[in-house]
């Protein structure tokens, strides 16, 4: 059966929690990714600013699930209007920021 | 240390407004929510409302919405509560609290109080 | 908006007596993520209120195993299983699920 949206989304934290509490060396070795805005989309603008970060398996989990909350498909290289404009962040700054928004979300209920 | 410091007393007159800050020490606002609550004297707690200040994402009770206008500044780690057309009832200990970091499941840390006086 | 009603409003205890306050919701408080936001704060005169009890029956870090919290639904009790003096104030239940977040009335608890 489905997973209920407020599960995934709590999985999803969860993955973020572990790799911000395991995190020792630089996370995929101080990569650089787009900044987004933390709006609506935030999904699909997370993930499209990820996958251009290659390997580095301490994130492939969390780039599959961003995947199943994204409506549609992203590759590498394709970017939204939600990027913040010529803003680079490392990535480990990124996870954090995510996971601080995503934890909001779900406090307020908003899983979708 | 994480703590919240609120501004000191007020004394103002009826019709007057005023603006009550909190200012956060030992983490981030933008990382958590903050909530202000008001207790009249000798009465209970009523939430007032509480702001995301990494969006400004602002929630009020109803009954204080038109009264109260939360705002945050990020960059001195402020919150304040600014309250208008005061009047008697307006008297009271406005304390601001943050949702604890993790799940923002409670308050876990809450400012020392500031105390209103409406008077002429 | 969910009004929480709390009862007694004043409970007289005699030192090392078990004290229970009840305090109950006008709707469920379950949210929407399954979480149930009922938590219990102490108030001391001439203090800030004090986290006792989050999400039902948690005690938070520090507070003495002598607190308890359980319930579920719309009912819920606040146990002090052997009161002593630095107990005494005023205790609050508090709902955290639904918007505008609610307290419930306060119970003062003071020696008989």
């Known amino acids: 059966s489905p997973v209920p949206p407020s599960t995934a989304l709590k999985e999803l934290i969860e993955e973020l929690v572990n790799i911000t509490q395991n995190q020792k060396a630089p996370l995929c070795n101080g990569s650089m990714v787009w900044s987004i805005n933390l709006t609506a989309g935030v999904y699909c603008a997370a993930l499209e600013s990820l996958i251009n970060v290659s390997g580095c398996s301490a994130i492939e989990k969390t780039q599959r699930m961003l995947n199943g909350f994204c409506p549609h498909k992203v590759s590498a290289g394709q970017f939204s209007s939600l990027r913040v404009r010529d803003t680079k962040i490392e990535v480990a700054q990124f996870v954090k920021d995510l996971l601080v928004h995503l934890k909001k979300l779900f406090r307020e209920g908003q899983f979708n | 240390e994480v703590q919240l410091q609120q501004s000191g007393a007020e004394l103002v007159k009826p019709g007057a407004s005023v603006k009550l800050s909190c200012t956060g020490s030992?983490?981030?606002?933008?990382?958590?929510?903050i909530h202000w609550v008001k207790q009249r004297p000798e009465q209970g707690l009523e939430w007032i409302g509480r702001i995301d200040p990494a969006n400004d994402n602002i929630k009020y009770d109803p009954k204080f919405q038109g009264k109260a206008t939360i705002t945050a500044d990020t960059s001195s780690n402020t919150a304040y509560l600014q309250l208008n057309s005061l009047t008697s009832e307006d008297t009271a200990v406005y304390y601001c609290?943050?949702?604890?970091?993790?799940?923002?499941?409670?308050?876990?840390?809450w400012g020392q109080g500031t105390t209103l006086t409406v008077s002429s | 908006d969910v009004l929480m009603t709390q009862t007694p409003l004043s409970l007289p205890v005699s030192l090392g007596d078990q004290a229970s306050i009840s305090c109950r919701s006008s709707?469920?408080?379950?949210?929407?993520?399954?979480?149930?936001?009922l938590e219990w704060y102490l108030q001391k005169p001439g203090q800030s209120p004090k986290l006792l009890i989050y999400?039902?029956?948690n005690r938070f870090s520090g507070v003495p195993d002598r607190f308890s919290g359980s319930g579920s639904g719309t009912d819920f009790t606040l146990k002090i299983s052997r009161v002593e003096a630095e107990d005494l104030g005023v205790y609050y239940c508090f709902q955290g699920s639904h918007i505008p977040y609610t307290f419930g009335g306060g119970t003062k608890l003071e020696i008989k």
């Open positions: 030992g983490f981030n606002i933008k990382d958590t929510y």
């Open positions: 609290a943050r949702s604890e970091e993790n799940w923002y499941d409670f308050f876990d840390y």
């Open positions: 999400k039902v029956s």
């Open positions: 709707q469920s408080i379950v949210h929407s993520n399954g979480n149930t936001y």
